[in-house]
């Protein structure tokens, strides 16, 4: 099943997020992803946990998953590079780099997103955009078109409260509010964009969605700049 959903959001403006990727398994949407270089998509490591025997591809330039669009193109994956410290049973280091079979054809609907290299927390209350093709309600309805939601960043101390994530949020992770509007499992791998800069990647740990006491968890890309650079080099 697809890993992820945007709850309480709305349909995104078509092709206004040219960095947005759909990571697909055997032709079906599995996870979100973000184009960070001409030939590289960043996603979440857990996305490929159950994909050992399947064909992984990356869809770029899409708004609708099913409808023909001039900018849409499906790329094969040459190489999948999960973070070496990612493990199935933790949310830590949940990053994955996918090398496309060739450089993406760039244009207005396909363009890499600048990512944050300054390793400093995003200020609480900052409004950040999350987008994805995950299911849009608790009944499991899957959208055909890209959805998004604007969420405020939550301070780590609040996120780590015993009633919330109970100390699980390390300095390499960040949180965003989840009060009825939220990202969730299958938007995993998708981007958290603050002011035009990629700050976080949706983690793919199992978590109740849309509950304000269980904020959304995102991997801070700035904390992994050295690893990203080493893989892309």
């Amino acid at each position: 099943p697809p890993r992820g959903r945007i709850l309480g959001g709305r349909e995104a403006e078509a092709h206004a997020r040219p960095y947005m990727a759909s990571v697909q398994l055997n032709g079906a949407h599995l996870c979100g992803g973000v184009l960070v270089a001409e030939q590289w998509v960043l996603s979440a490591a857990h996305c490929l946990e159950d994909a050992a025997d399947g064909k992984v591809q990356v869809l770029l330039g899409a708004h609708s998953l099913s409808q023909p669009e001039p900018s849409k193109r499906l790329y094969d994956v040459l190489r999948a590079v999960p973070h070496p410290d990612s493990q199935p049973d933790t949310i830590d280091h949940d990053l994955l780099l996918l090398q496309l079979s060739e450089k993406a054809t760039l244009g207005p609907a396909v363009r890499p997103l600048p990512w944050q290299r300054v390793d400093r927390d995003v200020a609480p209350g900052t409004l950040c955009d999350v987008a994805g093709w995950g299911i849009v309600n608790h009944a499991g309805r899957r959208p055909d078109s890209l959805q998004h939601v604007l969420l405020p960043v939550l301070d780590r101390a609040t996120c780590n409260r015993r009633t919330h994530h109970d100390g699980a949020i390390t300095e390499r992770l960040m949180c965003a509010e989840s009060n009825r509007r939220d990202s969730c499992k299958g938007d995993s791998g998708g981007p958290l964009v603050c002011g035009g800069v990629l700050e976080g990647v949706v983690t793919s740990g199992s978590r109740v969605c849309g509950n304000r006491k269980k904020p959304g968890i995102y991997t801070r890309v700035a904390s992994y700049a050295a690893w990203i650079d080493s893989v892309l080099a």
Epitope: G8, R10, E13, A16, R17, Y19, P114, V118, V122, A123, P124, G125, T126, L127, C128, D129, A131, H148, L150, P152, E177, N179, R180, R181, V193, C194, G195, G196, V197
Partner: antibody
């Protein structure tokens, strides 16, 4: 068309509280953040905080925590700001403004109320 | 907090002239900058968002530029309705802060 209509001027005594309203029309109220600003006579603008009517989520500038309380009434598409323990320093014009979305995560205050003047005097 | 330093504080100009107002952020704000015009006794009006994009209905004589920490608003062929105060404001993190303003008056 989008409009934010604020309540009229207020003359209040020191130590009292005042509640300012901002009635939205011409758009889906629960889809957009509402920000509040303060402007003292002849001065610049200060950001007080925001509220998201869809979830009642709020965030305050540290400087205004304990001074301002933001609420909404979804049924009337109205945002409110309660200012408490008023002093002469709170005499100002207060504005509400809608936060509009532009492209993927750029946003700006695209529509503003006309402002509400609050005068604190004994 | 991010400080926004706006200059000049005031400017006396004639109609038809070109003026440039600058705004310096105390750190990189990644083009998350808006410009507003405010007339006496009125509310601010959005002119420019994301540093360079004109808001709906804003005349093309207005233009925004800049990146990183340095931004500017340029008004060419100044019209009588352009007199008033101008403010920059950042959207990079919280709290949101405004510049102190630039008052444009008729020479």
């Amino acid at each position: 068309q989008v409009q934010l209509q604020q309540s009229g001027p207020e003359l209040v005594k020191p130590g009292a509280s005042v509640k300012i309203s901002c009635k939205a029309s011409g758009y889906t109220f629960t889809d957009y953040y509402i920000n509040w600003m303060k402007q003292r006579p002849g001065q610049g603008l200060e950001w007080i905080g925001w509220i998201f009517p869809g979830s009642d989520s709020t965030y305050y500038n540290e400087k205004f925590k304990g001074k301002a309380t933001l609420t909404v009434d979804k049924s009337s598409s109205t945002a409110y700001m309660l200012l408490s323990s008023l002093t002469s320093e709170d005499s100002a014009v207060y504005f509400c403004a809608r936060l509009g979305y532009y492209s993927h995560s750029y946003y700006a205050m695209d529509y503003w109320g006309q402002g509400t003047s609050v005068t604190v005097s004994s | 907090d991010i400080q926004m330093t706006q200059s000049p504080a005031s400017l006396s100009v004639s109609t038809g002239e070109t003026v440039t107002i600058t705004c310096r952020a105390s750190e990189n704000i990644y083009s998350n900058l808006a410009w507003f015009q405010q007339k006496q006794g009125k509310s601010p009006q959005l002119l420019v968002y994301a540093a360079t994009n004109l808001a709906d209905g804003v005349p093309s004589r207005f233009s925004g530029s800049g990146s990183g920490t340095q931004y500017s608003l340029k008004i060419t062929s100044l019209q009588s309705e352009d007199f008033g105060s101008y403010y920059c404001q950042h959207f990079w993190g919280t709290p949101l802060t405004f510049g102190a303003g630039t008052k444009l008056d008729l020479k």
